[in-house]
């Protein structure tokens, strides 16, 4: 090994990371020029842009699939980007139907072959862009890793690329003899990586002596609002849940200039920027007569893009609850129902690129995801108590009002690339 490569400045030729198997779509969904109808932002690699679009497609479909299996009163929060990145780690070693299903479920088959063959390189570039922001006012921390039983010998090339691109080698653990100890080790690693914000990602009894390979991906974001809410203006107000019940939420308030639009059927879309302007929170609030479930059903990347393109800066009054959502779940059954079957099957899985001896019995036993978001007057997951002097509540009847006192969707996105980093719904901000 020579000097360590900086993936963020590297060129594809600097890092030979061709996957063991490549995928070719039978009905060629993607062409080299696909996506050219939309203007690519300046200083943006076209392939990173493509990858970001694929992630948005996966984000909305996975969210809809997950939301269909949740109660309408449940909060949801996840990072589609983090999930895609984690499963791209397995794509590097996948072949046959296992590879095809990964390509289809994660929408990697909608991007050009050149991008998908080198997907790890472009994921690294995307992550460099997101995680190495020069602006120190926001912080994005993720912990993605594969953990495998120590009886396996892992492919050295796979290990090197995994470390270089995803920041972590596959870690061997003793699942057979020490399942509970292994679970504790994984949870401890995640907790350390996320500065104690995310704990217990793997629930008890989720690992046993039959566990072979476990995929873990966790992420948290901390950002300060560009325009903070004054704590003096926060009041207890009723929040009307989907089931018709109400609860008492801490409703923050501020007046200011924000990008906003009332779109189809009276749905309101509001964008709140974090300091640095590159990362924003988008809130989607249906009118009181329309259920959030209907908006979720109609949501597509195209609809979302259209709404974001229509936003215009204007003076408005924002009422928004303080909330904290922590959501963690196994991805296995959700993804199996979406068509990612073979990866989790001892009989069908084909992951020859991960192990050294060319064994063909390697499969992913389970995959866990956990993300959390806390929103308060300072921003997202901010505990500092900077003094903010902002005018109190005014009674301007002509001002446009955005009052999130009923269930709404929330997105955290990187603006230039329009990458959906997080998405979820706030159905009950009153839960502690």
């Amino acid at each position: 090994h020579g000097s360590p490569v900086d993936i963020c400045t590297a060129k594809p030729r600097d890092i030979p990371m061709n996957p063991m198997c490549i995928y070719r779509s039978p009905e060629k969904k993607a062409t080299e020029d696909e996506g050219s109808e939309q203007k690519i932002p300046e200083a943006t690699n076209r392939r990173v842009w493509e990858l970001s679009k694929a992630n948005s497609r996966f984000a909305t479909t996975f969210y809809q699939h997950l939301a269909d299996s949740k109660n309408d009163n449940d909060n949801i929060f996840l990072s589609p980007l983090s999930i895609s990145t984690a499963f791209a780690m397995t794509k590097l070693g996948a072949c046959n139907d296992t590879l095809q299903q990964l390509m289809e479920v994660f929408k990697f088959d909608t991007i050009s072959e050149k991008t998908s063959d080198q997907i790890h390189f472009f994921f690294a570039k995307l992550n460099c862009r997101l995680y190495r922001k020069a602006n120190k006012s926001s912080k994005l921390v993720s912990a993605n890793r594969l953990f495998g039983d120590k009886s396996l010998t892992f492919n050295e090339t796979y290990q090197d690329i995994s470390e270089l691109v995803y920041g972590a080698k596959l870690q061997p653990l003793d699942f057979k003899e020490n399942a509970e100890q292994s679970r504790a080790a994984i949870n401890k690693w995640v907790s350390n990586k996320t500065e104690g914000r995310i704990t217990d990602v793997i629930p008890s009894e989720a690992i046993n002596e039959l566990t072979v390979l476990v995929l873990v991906n966790t992420i948290y974001f901390k950002g300060l609002w560009k325009s903070k809410f004054s704590p003096e203006n926060t009041r207890k107000e009723l929040f009307y849940k989907a089931d018709g019940e109400s609860c008492s939420a801490s409703m923050m308030y501020q007046e200011g200039k924000f990008r906003y639009r009332r779109v189809a059927e009276g749905t309101q879309v509001l964008e709140l920027p974090f300091k640095g302007d590159d990362i924003t929170m988008v809130l989607i609030l249906p009118k009181p007569e329309k259920s959030l479930a209907k908006v979720e059903k109609e949501l597509t990347p195209e609809v979302l893009q259209e709404w974001l393109d229509e936003l215009e800066e204007m003076m408005l009054v924002v009422h928004m609850p303080r909330f904290r959502i922590e959501d963690g779940f196994s991805l296995k059954e959700q993804l199996q129902d979406m068509g990612l079957v073979d990866l989790f099957s001892p009989e069908k899985s084909k992951l020859p690129g991960i192990v050294a001896e060319g064994r063909d019995d390697l499969y992913v036993s389970d995959a866990f995801h956990k993300a959390f978001l806390e929103v308060n007057e300072e921003g997202s997951e901010a505990a500092a108590s900077t003094a903010v002097v902002i005018a109190g509540r005014s009674l301007n009847p002509n001002r446009v009002t955005f009052k999130a006192n009923r269930p709404f969707l929330v997105f955290i996105r990187e603006v230039p690339l329009n990458t959906i980093i997080f998405m979820g719904r706030v159905a009950n901000p009153c839960v502690k």
Epitope: Q64, H65, D68, S69, N71, D72, A293, E333, Q334, D337
Partner: nanobody, 114 residues
């Protein structure tokens, strides 16, 4: 991939009844929201009724009071009880997820005619 198999359609006179069934192979069946849709010739597919994992139901205005959606989680099956059928209910009926739709099944033809 989730397989959907609809059955129970047929030819029925106006005012008659039918009970449609849909067997779904989803691992997450019991917690999942399911829906019945229909498509009449030359028309767009439309939502008829939906049921959440918790059992909350919703109906299109045109079928309210006549149709009832239900589920049996033990059998991974969703039902649509159709009463007081009208000629305008003639369509191919499909079941699928509510927000997320899997590959569509063959559907089951419902024809209401005297």
């Amino acid at each position: 991939q989730v397989q959907l198999q609809e059955s129970g359609g047929g030819l029925v006179q106006p005012g008659g009844s039918l009970r449609l069934s849909c067997a779904a192979s989803a691992l997450t069946f019991s917690s999942r929201a399911w829906a019945w849709y229909r498509q009449a010739p030359g028309k767009q597919r439309e939502l008829v009724a939906s049921i959440t994992g918790g059992g909350t139901t919703n109906y299109a205005d045109s079928v309210k009071g006549r149709f009832t959606i239900s589920r049996d989680n033990a059998k991974n099956t969703v039902y649509l009880q159709m009463n007081s059928l009208k000629p305008e209910d003639t369509a191919v009926h499909y079941c699928n997820g509510y927000r997320y739709t899997y590959a569509w099944g063959q559907g089951t033809q419902v024809t209401v005619s005297s």
